[in-house]
């Protein structure tokens, strides 16, 4: 069991680090950054950089921190109260229907289409027909048919697939 030391057990010069603190549940729940003990009487801190909890809870265990995959960059590290924030590298994006991996953005639009949206970490470039303005979701065009684009940089939290 992690962090079973109470503050009172220690001399002033040996005070436990924040991740070792233990407290009592409030109305049966423990605060963010903690999980409940086996007997339900104590709140035990999550381990910084290893696991976390984001809400008041009665969880037996803190949740494992996400580890950013290769092809992702870490925007913010895991704390005891917040999961790691990962983002696809420049030029790649994560689709909602395949959140476990970053895919390469298309480099441009097919002939007869114009780019109306940049590559972002969560979306491919967006192309529309010049005349009708309807969106295109076809295959990646040949190089001579492309209009190049530059990737965007906004951030998005990553999925829970360490």
């Amino acid at each position: 069991e992690s962090a079973l030391i109470t503050q009172q057990d220690l001399a002033p010069q040996q005070r436990a680090a924040p991740q070792q603190k233990r407290s009592s549940p409030s109305e049966g729940l423990c605060p963010p950054g903690h999980h409940i003990s086996e007997d339900g009487r104590d709140c035990i801190s999550c381990k910084y950089g290893q696991d976390y909890s984001t809400h008041w809870n009665d969880l037996l265990f803190c949740l494992r921190c996400t580890r950013c995959d290769s092809g992702e960059v870490e925007l913010s590290p895991c704390t005891t109260t917040r999961n790691t924030v990962c983002q696809c590298e420049e030029g790649t994006f994560r689709e909602e229907d395949s959140p476990e991996m970053c895919r390469k953005c298309r480099t441009g639009c097919p002939r007869g289409m114009v780019k109306v949206g940049d590559c972002t970490p969560w979306s491919d470039i967006e192309c529309v027909h010049k005349e009708s303005g309807t969106k295109h979701s076809g295959e990646v065009p040949a190089v001579e048919e492309t209009v190049t684009s530059s990737p965007g940089t906004p951030a998005s939290p990553c999925s829970l697939s360490g």
Epitope: E1, S2, I36, N57, L59, L60, E100, L160, G162
Partner: nanobody, 124 residues
Framework: EVQLLESGGGLVQPGGSLRLSCAAS????????MSWFRQAPGKGLEFVSA????????YYADSVKGRFTISRDNSKNTLYLQMNSLRAEDTAVYYC?????????????????WGQGTLVTVSS
């Protein structure tokens, strides 16, 4: 998604031992807390034991404390339940489950994945 397959059940005499295994495939096993539940004939599902993602923290129901030991081997994607001093009342179908965590009463937190179960019969 995680697929779970239990094994190791069987017929054992009172006082005997069994070791159940739960083999996982699919997404990263080590991301999940794991647990064992059981369902005795004609009864509801009972939370037996649980273990956190790295095996450091464990939970046991009062009915099995001191007799059962839960463990996991993340390198083998396998969860175990060592059952000693078995009693007739331990007779049940044992299920393993994976979830991000489990609440104090045993309720899985987030999406839960379940095995098909393995039958343990304790009888002389």
């Amino acid at each position: 998604e995680v697929q779970l397959l239990e094994s190791g059940g069987g017929l054992v005499q009172p006082g005997g031992s069994l070791r159940l295994s739960c083999a996982a495939s699919g997404r990263a096993f080590s991301n999940y807390a794991m647990s064992w539940f059981r369902q005795a004939p004609g009864k509801g599902l009972e939370f037996v034991s649980a273990i956190n993602w790295n095996g450091e923290n464990r939970y046991y129901a009062d009915s099995v404390k001191g007799r059962f030991t839960i463990s996991r081997d993340n390198s083998k994607n396998t969860l175990y339940l060592q059952m000693n001093s078995l009693r007739a009342e331990d007779t049940a179908v044992y299920y393993c489950a994976a979830a991000l965590s489990f609440r104090l009463g045993g309720e899985p937190y987030g999406d839960a994945y379940w095995g098909q179960g393995t039958l343990v019969t304790v009888s002389s």
